[in-house]
């Protein structure tokens, strides 16, 4: 007798791991034999799909290798034309052992900053993530927290946070461990003991003592009046991330001695400085106007213009004379990028020699200004047009800062080489001959206001500006 289909084994929820086999059973009793169809999330499963296996006239549906995307509701429908179709449904829950999809990596971090060690996981049920530091489970506190994502966040990193870490992802199906990674805490260079100032008699021996720490251990360099220490002996020792440096000096002149501790953090450096003055009893006081010292030029901008090993005046009215004066030149040079090729080398020579004035290293270090004649040569011969434009802009207040005003000397206020040849500095790199002047294109309608002297020719010119003069 014909019999309507009855599902004798209703579908049940099936749990399966990724890549495992999953089978749904839909046992049906009927006569004649029913047609059984299967759906996943209400979409018909094509029975010729090789990912599925059908057995016993469709009563068994097998997914041969479960994928994440197979998760869902599966239904079987049986129909034999007698009575209505019958349906049974069950869920496939794709389970997954924990998997660390973004493991932590080695981190170098500066003390006080925030460190985040990633640990992104997959799994079903969702894995819980914990961390191990060294051999012990890591305890969370106000600074240390495991984020929802599984990542470890450490606020205000401390030296003691350094060490070996690994994350652990756990669910009911298993546990996954990340590889061990290293958290290295770096500490900016810091001076623990600064050198002390001394007032001593001429010819005394003095030992300056400087102690610094940091991670990595810093190096210590000593600076004497802005230059690397040329005399004296340095003794160093390192213990427990502390470097101790002793500079022994034979005192023949007063000086400013700076201890500089430097360590490297990736591509960047951290520096700590401490200075001490060595004064000599009965030493004459420097004039009030000339606050500064002589030092070899160590910058970059004026390298090509100033003589090699030139002794220049560094003005101590700036906190960091070298840096401040270099910045002045740099700013002024940027504005020279638009001037003519005739003007530019001359202006560069003038600027560098004006900002980094030649220094007379006597008892009181004294700057030597540029001779007026050289200043006027640049102003009225090489850079006449540009000078006019610049003065006009100055009056109209078109410059962004007043810095450039310091960069351009007022020629009229400079000493003339005719008054005292030793009182002013020449520009040895500015070289031309009077008889060649007629070959210059006219640069200004007015003729120079002073008699331009024959300037001494330069023996070494690194680039030729025109057939009539050259400059280095």
């Amino acid at each position: 007798l014909p019999k309507a289909p009855v599902i004798t084994t209703p579908l049940e929820t099936v749990d399966a791991l990724v890549e495992e086999v999953a089978t749904f059973m839909c046992a049906v009793e009927s006569y004649p034999q029913p047609e059984i169809s299967w759906t996943r999330n209400k979409i018909l499963i094509k029975l010729f799909d090789t990912r599925y296996s059908i057995r016993e006239n469709g009563q068994l549906l097998t997914i041969l290798s479960v994928e994440d995307s197979d998760d869902g509701i599966y239904c079987c429908t049986a129909n034999n034309g007698v009575g209505g179709a019958v349906e049974s449904c069950g869920a496939l829950q794709v389970k997954m052992k924990p998997k660390i999809t973004r493991p932590p990596i080695n981190v170098k971090i500066i003390e006080g900053l925030k460190a985040v060690l990633p640990c992104t996981t997959m799994g079903n049920p969702k894995p819980s993530v914990s961390w191990i530091k060294g051999d012990s489970p890591l305890r969370e506190n106000s600074r240390i927290a495991v984020l929802e994502s599984g990542s470890l966040r450490i606020h205000n990193v401390q030296k003691e946070d350094a060490g070996q870490y690994r994350c652990v992802a756990k669910n009911s199906l298993g546990t996954a461990y990340s590889k061990v990674v290293k958290l290295e805490v770096e500490v900016f260079a810091r001076i623990l003991r600064a050198p002390e100032s001394h007032n001593v008699t001429f010819g005394s021996f003095v030992t300056l003592h400087c102690t610094a720490t940091g991670i990595p251990v810093p190096t210590i360099t000593w600076i004497e009046n802005g230059n690397a220490v040329s005399s004296g002996s340095i003794q160093e020792s390192v213990k427990d991330r502390v470097i101790d440096s002793r500079l022994q000096l034979f005192i023949t002149k007063p000086g400013l001695y700076t201890c500089i501790a430097t360590n490297k953090h990736g591509e960047k450096f951290s520096t700590a400085k401490a200075a001490a003055t060595i004064s000599i009893a009965e030493w004459s006081k420097p004039q009030k106007d000339n606050k500064g010292y002589c030092a070899q030029y160590r910058g970059e901008v004026c390298n090509a213009v100033l003589a090699k090993d030139a002794l220049v005046f560094l003005n101590t009215s700036y906190a960091d004379p070298e840096e401040a004066q270099e910045l002045l030149v740099h700013t002024a040079w940027n504005e020279l990028k638009v001037v003519s090729p005739v003007c530019r080398p001359a202006a560069e020579a003038l600027l560098c020699n004006h900002i980094f004035q030649e220094c007379s290293p006597g008892v009181v270090p004294t700057p030597i200004p540029i001779c007026r004649e050289y200043c006027l040569a640049v102003k009225e011969l090489f850079c006449a047009k540009e000078w006019l434009v610049m003065e006009e802009k100055t009056h109209r207040g078109l410059y962004r800062s007043e810095m450039h005003l310091l960069s351009v000397p007022e020629c009229s206020k400079l000493p003339s080489m005719h008054w005292d040849p030793t009182a002013c500095a020449r520009l040895p790199h500015l070289d031309y001959n009077k008889e060649n002047l007629k070959t210059f294109p006219p640069m200004t309608s007015s003729k120079p206001s002073v008699d331009i002297p024959n300037l001494p020719s330069s023996s070494s010119s690194s680039f030729s500006v025109s057939p009539t003069y050259s400059m280095t």
Epitope: T9, A16, T23, Q33, S53, E56, T62
Partner: antibody, heavy 121, light 107 residues
Framework: EDLLVESGGGLVKPGQSLTLSCAAS????????MAWVRQAPGKGLEWVAS????????YYADSLKGRFTLSRDNARNSFFLEMNSLRAEDTAVYYC??????????????WGQGSLVAVSS | DIHMTQSPSSLSSSVGDRVTMTCRAS??????VNWYQQKPGRAPTLLIS???TLQSGVPSRFSGSASGTDFTLTISGLQPEDSAIYYC?????????FGQGTKVEIK
């Protein structure tokens, strides 16, 4: 009573072919899934292949795919296993079995007496 | 493929003893496990299907149970005629696999 009888076994040389037959009676053959199961001398049971009643679904053990072919003739209630490129390790008693839907899954509820295939040079 | 690991490979017990053998599946397979008995020179016979359903004509001393991926066949009160090799088989995957077998001997 359900009855399964295998035939076609014998001694063959490596590389040769052989076809086993299984004659069925006593049940609705065309509605039944049939299987071959083999047993090497002194070893355990190994499933070889299965074919559904309508021959739409055929499954082979991975290790045998490509060398063995399953077929059936519902009109003659017969079931066949064609074995090519035989190897010494194919030496076994080959059983014909009927697969039946159980409360959960399927099982081999009816077996033939077995047919010995010996592969030797 | 789903792998079925059967243990022990053999056991020897006296008549009347309670004997158990285990099959472990390499993944969850619900209750899709059958047990077969094979006597020397004979074809296997189905004893238990669906992990615990006794086939008709099989003595009640045979029973089956399941726990996770572990399946157990128990003979409570071993009889001389129970001397045979017992195989488990999974039908969860259409690529059927058997356990290696447990040989039961009577002391």
């Amino acid at each position: 009573e359900d009855l399964l009888v295998e035939s076609g076994g014998g001694l063959v040389k490596p590389g040769q072919s052989l076809t086993l037959s299984c004659a069925a009676s006593g049940f609705d053959f065309s509605a039944s899934t049939m299987a071959w199961v083999r047993q090497a001398p002194g070893k355990g049971l190994e499933w070889v292949a299965s074919v559904s009643g309508d021959s739409h679904h055929i499954y082979y053990a991975d290790s045998l795919k490509g060398r063995f072919t399953l077929s059936r003739d519902n009109a003659r209630n017969s079931f066949f296993l064609e074995m090519n490129s035989l190897r010494a390790e194919d030496t076994a008693v080959y059983y014909c079995a009927r697969e039946r839907l159980l409360r959960l899954g399927v099982g081999f509820d009816s077996w033939g007496q077995g047919s010995l295939v010996a592969v030797s040079s | 493929d789903i792998h079925m690991t059967q243990s022990p490979s053999s056991l020897s017990s006296s008549v009347g003893d309670r004997v158990t053998m285990t099959c472990r599946a390499s993944q969850r397979i619900s209750g899709f496990v059958n047990w077969y008995q094979q006597k020397p020179g004979r074809a296997p016979t189905l004893l238990i299907s669906a992990a615990s359903t006794l086939q008709s004509g099989v003595p009640s001393r045979f029973s089956g149970s399941a726990s996770g991926t572990d399946f157990t066949l128990t003979i409570s009160g071993l009889q001389p005629e129970d001397s045979a090799i017992y195989y488990c088989q999974q039908s969860y995957s259409p690529l059927y696999t058997f356990g290696q077998g447990t040989k039961v001997e009577i002391k």
